[in-house]
C-alpha cells in the first residue's frame, strides 16, 4: 500500500551538519522518493487464498495522517472450490514503519518518532498442531 | 498539508500544518516490536507461498536493517507438498518510512525516506488472458 502524498517544496541542502540540541534530533519531513510507484499485482487482496480487507486509520496529529491496515477476511483459507478450508489458517503479515507524532502540552507542541506495526496483507499457512498428552 | 486542531486558548501564531522541519525527542515510542521477522514468526516457511528473507543493511539509515522477502516459487505449495503452477506466489509490497541521515552522515539530523519493501508472499488465483 502507498503512503499518502503531502505537498512540500524542496530546499537547498546545507553542506555542514546543523546544530542540534542535546537529547533531540532534527527531522525533515519532506519525503525522499515521494513519487515512487507501488507495482503490486492487481487485486491480490481479493484473489488471494487468504483474502483481506483494507481499513484506513486517520489521525491528524500523526504524520503521515493516513495509515492503511489490512484484516484477514477468514480464519481459514479459500480452496479451489471457493470454499473456506479451516484445516489451513489465514494469518496477517506485518511490517514496521515510522511515523511522527505531534503532541500538545498546553500551548506547547512537541514531536515524537513512533514505530507503528502495519498489517500489510495475509498469507495462508499450515497450522501448528499442539498434541495434548 | 495536514490540518492540526489547535487549543483554542493558545496564541494564533501556531501553524495549522505540520512544519517542514521538526525537532524530535531522542526516544522512539513503541520501540519493543521485534524487527527480525525470522524471530517473530515462521510464516515464511509454513506458508503455501513460502519466501526467503534477505537482509538489507545500511548504516546511514534507521532502521539500519530491513528484511526483504523473495517468493521461493512461481506457484504455490499444494496439500501434497508439491508446487502447483495453477496458482501464483506473489509478493506483498508495502511503502514504509525510514530515516536517512541528511545532510549525509550527520549524526542527529535526518530526513524521512519512503522505501518499498516486499514483506511476504501470498498465494493468488492467476489472471488468465484469453487470446481471441
Amino acid at each position: 500500500r502507498k503512503i499518502p502524498k503531502v505537498g512540500h517544496t524542496f530546499f537547498q541542502k546545507p553542506e555542514s551538519c546543523p546544530p542540534v540540541p542535546g537529547g533531540s534530533m532534527k527531522l525533515d519531513i519532506g519525503i525522499i522518493n515521494e513519487n515512487q510507484r507501488v507495482s503490486m499485482s492487481r487485486n491480490i487482496e481479493s484473489r488471494s487464498t487468504s483474502p483481506w480487507n483494507y481499513t484506513v486509520t486517520w489521525d491528524p496529529n500523526r504524520y503521515p495522517s493516513e495509515v492503511v491496515q489490512a484484516q484477514c477476511r477468514n480464519l481459514g483459507c479459500i480452496n479451489a472450490q471457493g470454499k473456506e478450508d479451516i484445516s489451513m489458517n489465514s494469518v496477517p503479515i506485518q511490517q514496521e514503519t515510522l511515523v511522527v507524532r505531534r503532541k500538545h502540552q498546553g500551548c506547547s507542541v512537541s514531536f515524537q518518532l513512533e514505530k507503528v506495526l502495519v498489517t500489510v496483507g495475509c498469507t495462508c499457512v499450515t497450522p501448528v498442531i499442539h498434541h495434548v498428552q | 498539508g495536514i490540518t492540526i486542531p489547535r487549543n483554542p486558548g493558545c496564541p494564533n501564531s501556531e501553524d495549522k500544518n505540520f512544519p517542514r522541519t521538526v525537532m524530535v525527542n531522542l526516544n522512539i515510542h513503541n520501540r519493543n516490536t521485534n524487527t527480525n521477522p525470522k524471530r517473530s514468526s515462521d510464516y515464511y516457511n509454513r506458508s503455501t507461498s513460502p519466501w526467503n528473507l534477505h537482509r538489507n543493511e545500511d548504516p546511514e539509515r534507521y532502521p539500519s536493517v530491513i528484511w526483504e522477502a523473495k517468493c521461493r516459487h512461481l506457484g504455490c505449495i499444494n496439500a501434497d507438498g508439491n508446487v502447483d503452477y495453477h496458482m501464483n506466489s506473489v509478493p506483498i509490497q508495502q511503502e514504509i518510512l525510514v530515516l536517512r541521515r541528511e545532510p549525509p552522515h550527520c549524526p542527529n539530523s535526518f530526513r524521512l525516506e519512503k522505501i518499498l519493501v516486499s514483506v511476504g508472499c501470498t498465494c493468488v488465483t492467476p489472471i488468465v488472458h484469453h487470446v481471441a
Epitope: - | 543493511e57 539500519s64 536493517v65 542527529n108
Partner: nanobody
Framework: EVQLVESGGGLVQAGGSLSLSCAAS????????MRWHRQAPGKQREFLAS???????NYADSVKGRFTISRDNAKNTVYLQMNSLKPEDTAVYYC???????????WGLGTQVTVSS
C-alpha cells in the same frame, strides 16, 4: 545511557599508522551502528566511517582506502585502523554509537591524534 571510551590516540609521524578502539558500556541494550568522526581545531565534526551490526561499512571519500573500520559485536567494540597518515589527519577522534531502539547518536569524549610532518 550508552557510555563510549576511545583509546589508541597519540603522536605519529606522517606516513605512519595508528589503531583506535572504542568500547561501549552502560545500558548497551543492543548497539546497532558504530561510527567514527573527527574534529580538527576550529572545524566542524567530520564523518569518517560507520559500520552496522552485520558488518556493512560506509566511508568518507577523504579516508577511503587509508582507514578501515571494524567491530567486535560480542565485546561491543569498534576499531579504526588508520594507515598513510597525513598532517591534515590531526584532530580529536570521536566514537559514536546508535542503539537499535533509536537513531540518536551517543558520543565518547574523544582521543587526540597528532600527525607530525
Amino acid at each position: 545511557e550508552v557510555q563510549l571510551v576511545e583509546s589508541g590516540g597519540g603522536l605519529v609521524q606522517a606516513g605512519g599508522s595508528l589503531s583506535l578502539s572504542c568500547a561501549a558500556s552502560g545500558s548497551v541494550f543492543r548497539i546497532d551502528v558504530m561510527r567514527w568522526h573527527r574534529q580538527a581545531p576550529g572545524k566542524q565534526r567530520e564523518f569518517l566511517a560507520s559500520i552496522a551490526s552485520g558488518g556493512t561499512t560506509n566511508y568518507a571519500d577523504s579516508v577511503k582506502g587509508r582507514f578501515t573500520i571494524s567491530r567486535d559485536n560480542a565485546k561491543n567494540t569498534v576499531y579504526l585502523q588508520m594507515n598513510s597518515l597525513k598532517p591534515e589527519d590531526t584532530a580529536v577522534y570521536y566514537c559514536g554509537a546508535n542503539a537499535e531502539s533509536g537513531p540518536y547518536t551517543y558520543w565518547g569524549l574523544g582521543t587526540q591524534v597528532t600527525v607530525s610532518s
